[in-house]
């Protein structure tokens, strides 16, 4: 159940991550599970543990097997499984099923291709890229952080894209590659300059003292899978997670919604008990994407009691 | 993201059992984690019943294991407390939580439940 | 069971100021290299809300004002600069063994 696959190629690095992770700072204790073995915490290993991590520095097809992490708990020890093959190169061209990543998809619009398991690493930019063997040059291609761009994306573009970067490690220097496949769709879609569609621009939004109040943000961006397109809240200019204000937070992850075609965001803004000061602050509703930013200010206002006339 | 949702009669008669269903949302009680339920009696401060694990095993504070049945159902994504044999003093405000590790990480709102005849 | 006794029961502090809470267990909930007290802020009327777990660790989306401290027996949770916001009942609770258990509250007023 708490099981996960991992590959990797000899004499590459390969960091491993427990299946069952614990927050930070919790003990994790690693295990070659055939011999029951524990695997060292000493960085001078070849493969060694740390924390949530199992490192093989490098690899070598001998590793291959199931390896068991324990995240130690005196109420409720957690064990997960890496299940760990290593494998020999290959010294043609061809990449193996068995060693590719999940297939991502792109479109005239959207080109990004992540390099696969990259977080785990200690490495910095920039990465290499390959496609079917072949190291990308030209303009079209930019290696962006973990991630490539292909620019004006065609249907030759399909293909193997193999990342290739350096993991440092005690100043010693690792080398791994990644690889999956990359499709493309055909997608007749194009981007606006964002429109937002609430709330309206300048709007005084009634709320009671002392009670939860939603803002929503919503925006229009074009037709189709937008590349680079957002929707967020500022407080004073300021971003809510700067603000720190525990009370008002913005709704994890934006929803995406297709109204008429249109590739719309949206972010809820909630504020719990709300207070008099709630209502000093400027809510800005922000929206960019690639052609610009667009900002529509929202003010709150304490809703009256009905007065009731006999 | 977790959201738990506490139910049940809001009144029970001393003696007689309370129950309480947590309904979980965002994520299955089968996969991980453990489910727990804590009470808190009005101005008073918080106090661990027990939990049921993803594997369903149950563990219970010894003060009221004799009374307590944790159990779930897998098919509603749903947890229930019973507590039987009531007093005034089982008066409280009953939270369901979500036991990621060792901390309680996701409540419920809580649900008042006032024994009373 | 092991007993958590907080201190004070209920302590007023001036915007700016430093709290101090401590919390302390009757026996170790230290082993192995790390100690196993947490930390839970509550409001009125709202649920308990995790602030600190492992005697020192902050919890994802937590102001860095909050902090703990402590190992063993005795242990600290720390506000500093306290906020107006930060008016509520503090609770330890441990997870060294069955039951968990928690302290008794302290009350944080704002001056």
């Known amino acids: 159940k708490f099981s996960k696959q991992s590959w990797g190629l000899e004499n590459e690095a390969l960091i491993v991550r427990c299946p069952r992770q614990g927050k930070p700072s919790y003990t994790v204790d690693w295990y070659y599970s055939q011999t029951n073995k524990s695997i060292p915490t000493q960085e001078r290993n070849r493969v060694f543990a740390s924390g949530q991590l199992l490192k093989f520095l490098p690899a070598a097809v001998a590793d291959s097997g199931i390896y068991t992490c324990i995240v130690r708990s005196p109420t409720f020890n957690r064990t997960g499984y890496a299940n760990v093959t290593i494998y020999k190169k290959q010294s043609d061209c061809n990449v193996p099923d068995y060693l590719m990543y999940s297939t991502v998809s792109g479109s005239e619009k959207n080109s990004k291709i992540y390099c696969p398991t990259i977080d785990l690493y200690n490495w910095t930019a920039p990465l290499e890229w390959f496609k079917n063997c072949q190291a990308l040059q030209g303009s079209r291609y930019r290696a962006h952080k973990s991630f490539l761009v292909i620019d004006n994306v065609m249907t030759e573009d399909a293909g193997d894209y193999t990342c290739k970067f350096i993991h440092n490690e005690n100043g010693a220097n690792y080398s791994v590659t990644a690889t999956r496949s990359f499709t493309v769709k055909d997608e007749q879609g194009f981007s606006l300059f964002p429109v937002i569609g609430a709330p309206a621009q300048n709007e005084i939004k009634e709320v009671e003292i002392g009670k939860n109040a939603n803002l929503t943000c919503s925006a229009c961006f074009g037709k189709g899978t937008q590349f680079l397109a957002a929707v967020l809240w500022q407080l004073n200019g300021t971003k809510i997670t700067d603000f720190g204000e525990p009370r008002i937070q913005q709704e994890e992850g934006q929803n995406q919604s297709f109204s008429n075609g249109l590739a719309c965001l949206d972010m809820v803004l909630r504020i719990a008990d709300v207070k008099e000061e709630d209502l000093l602050l400027q809510y800005d509703c922000l929206a960019l994407n690639l052609h610009g930013l667009r900002r529509h200010t929202v003010r709150l206002s304490r809703k009256n009691p009905i007065d009731h006339h006999s | 993201q977790v959201q738990l949702q506490e139910s049940g009669p809001g009144l029970v008669k001393p003696s007689q059992t309370l129950s309480l269903t947590c309904t979980v949302s965002?994520?299955?009680?089968?996969?991980?984690?453990?489910w727990d339920w804590i009470r808190q009696p009005p101005g008073k401060g918080l106090e661990w019943i027990g939990y049921?694990?993803?594997?369903?095993?149950?563990y219970y504070n010894p003060s009221l294991k004799s009374r307590v049945t944790i159990s779930r159902d897998t098919s509603k994504n749903q947890f229930s407390l019973k507590l039987s044999s009531v007093t005034a003093a089982d008066t409280a405000v009953y939270y369901c939580?979500?036991?990621?590790?060792?901390?309680?990480?996701?409540w419920g709102q809580g649900t008042l439940v006032t024994v009373s005849s | 069971d092991i007993v958590l006794t907080q201190s004070p029961a209920s302590l007023a502090v001036s915007p700016g100021q430093r709290a101090t809470i401590t919390c302390r267990a009757s026996?170790?909930?230290?082993?192995?290299?790390?100690?196993?007290m947490h930390w839970y802020q509550q409001k009125p009327g709202q649920p308990p809300k995790l602030l600190i777990y492992?005697?020192?660790n902050l919890e994802s989306g937590v102001p860095a004002r909050f902090s703990g401290s402590g190992s063993g027996t005795d242990f600290t949770l720390t506000i500093n600069p306290v906020e107006a916001n930060d008016a509520a009942n503090y609770y330890c609770?441990?997870?060294?063994?069955?039951?968990?258990?928690f302290g008794q509250g302290t009350k944080l007023e704002i001056k």
């Open positions: 609770q441990h997870s060294r063994e069955f039951p968990l258990t």
């Open positions: 026996k170790s909930v230290s082993t192995s290299g790390n100690s196993y």
């Open positions: 939580a979500t036991t990621m590790m060792d901390t309680m990480d996701y």
């Open positions: 049921i694990r993803y594997s369903g095993d149950t």
């Open positions: 492992l005697a020192s």
């Open positions: 965002g994520y299955s009680i089968t996969s991980d984690y453990a």
